[in-house]
């Protein structure tokens, strides 16, 4: 798994990293849930999408998210996730033309309608964490991760490597 001790060195390079090419290396439709098995759901309300973190009823279908995976150049030779010298970044789209965006000013995660090429706020570095969970780090703000706060997704600043293991930034990407 990703070396926790290397996270500062690893993330320092994010501002300078550029996505190799414009095509994803792979795409996958997955359901997204928290470390504690709550589902991430998306609801259309007043012509905009809201994101919720909730327990589903027994037979309720999980929402699916299209993850697009990009390989990004990693300027240093630190060994991080992925191919040596490269790291995986993802965009997450729960419905056509809408992508998860990091709003760093509001510390929020929002769904925005936009066209390609997508802005940097839509890209997240994928980290392989313990218990086969993943975390999503903002490309635009290294050290800031998608997390769960008050039954919503929010941006959470992780200021020390110990906090990287905190459950509220861990997610499961499951086959649907």
């Amino acid at each position: 798994a990703f070396g926790i001790s290397g996270v500062q060195k690893y993330t320092r390079a994010l501002h300078d990293s550029s996505i190799t090419g414009i095509s994803p290396i792979t795409e996958y439709l997955a359901s997204l849930s928290t470390y504690n098995d709550q589902s991430i759901t998306f609801a259309l309300e007043d012509e905009s999408y809201e994101i919720y973190v909730e327990d589903l009823k027994k037979d309720e279908k999980k929402d699916k998210v299209l993850l697009s995976y990009y390989e990004s150049q990693h300027p240093s030779n630190e060994s991080g996730d992925g191919v040596d010298g490269k790291m995986l970044m993802v965009t997450l789209s729960p419905t056509k033309d809408f992508w998860l965006h990091a709003n760093n000013k509001e510390h929020s995660v929002e769904l925005h309608k936009c066209e390609k090429p997508l802005p940097d706020q839509a890209f997240f570095v994928l980290h392989n964490m313990h218990s086969n969970c993943v975390s999503f780090e903002c490309k635009t703000d290294p050290g800031v991760f998608i997390g769960v706060k008050d039954n919503h997704l929010a941006l959470i600043k992780v200021d020390s490597s110990e906090n990287l293991c905190t459950e509220n930034i861990l997610f499961k990407l499951s086959e649907t």
Partner: nanobody
Framework: QVQLVESGGGLVQAGGSLRLSCAVS????????MGWFRQAPGKEREFVAN????????YSSDSAKGRFTISRDNAENTVYLQMNSLKPEDTAVYYC??????????????????WGQGTQVTVSS
């Protein structure tokens, strides 16, 4: 590009054991989900076992769980399938597969991104 090379297959008598190996290169091994699948003649490819980058495992059935053990060595970039108490119905080509996407213990063949060329296991009665 991820390269997977299986070895360890062969002909064995019923009740015997084999240890399959899969050497992985091309991507940091410790970020990969690894799986073993098998395909018997005229049948679909079926899931046997997987192991997450964090070490947790799942198996296809109680039968496989009791007889087969998947493990990995992150220092050696290798995943293993130890198969004990083999039966004629275990005869198949065994494939190693890798998922780069960070999925939570994937079992569906379509969830895996890279595949080895396969190694033949034949169990005679």
């Amino acid at each position: 590009q991820v390269q997977l090379v299986e070895s360890g297959g062969g002909l064995v008598q019923a009740g015997g054991s084999l240890r399959l190996s899969c050497a992985v290169s091309g991507r940091t091994f410790s970020t990969l989900n690894m799986g073993w699948f098998r395909q018997a003649p005229g049948k679909e490819r079926e899931f046997v076992a997987n192991i997450g980058w964090s070490g947790g495992t799942t198996y296809s059935s109680d039968s496989a769980k009791g007889r087969f053990t998947i493990s990995r060595d992150n220092a050696e970039n290798t995943v293993y399938l130890q198969m004990n108490s083999l039966k004629p119905e275990d005869t198949a080509v065994y494939y190693c597969a890798a998922d780069i996407k960070g999925l939570y213990f994937p079992r569906d063949a379509r969830s895996f991104d890279y595949w080895g060329q396969g190694t033949q296991v034949t169990v005679s009665s």
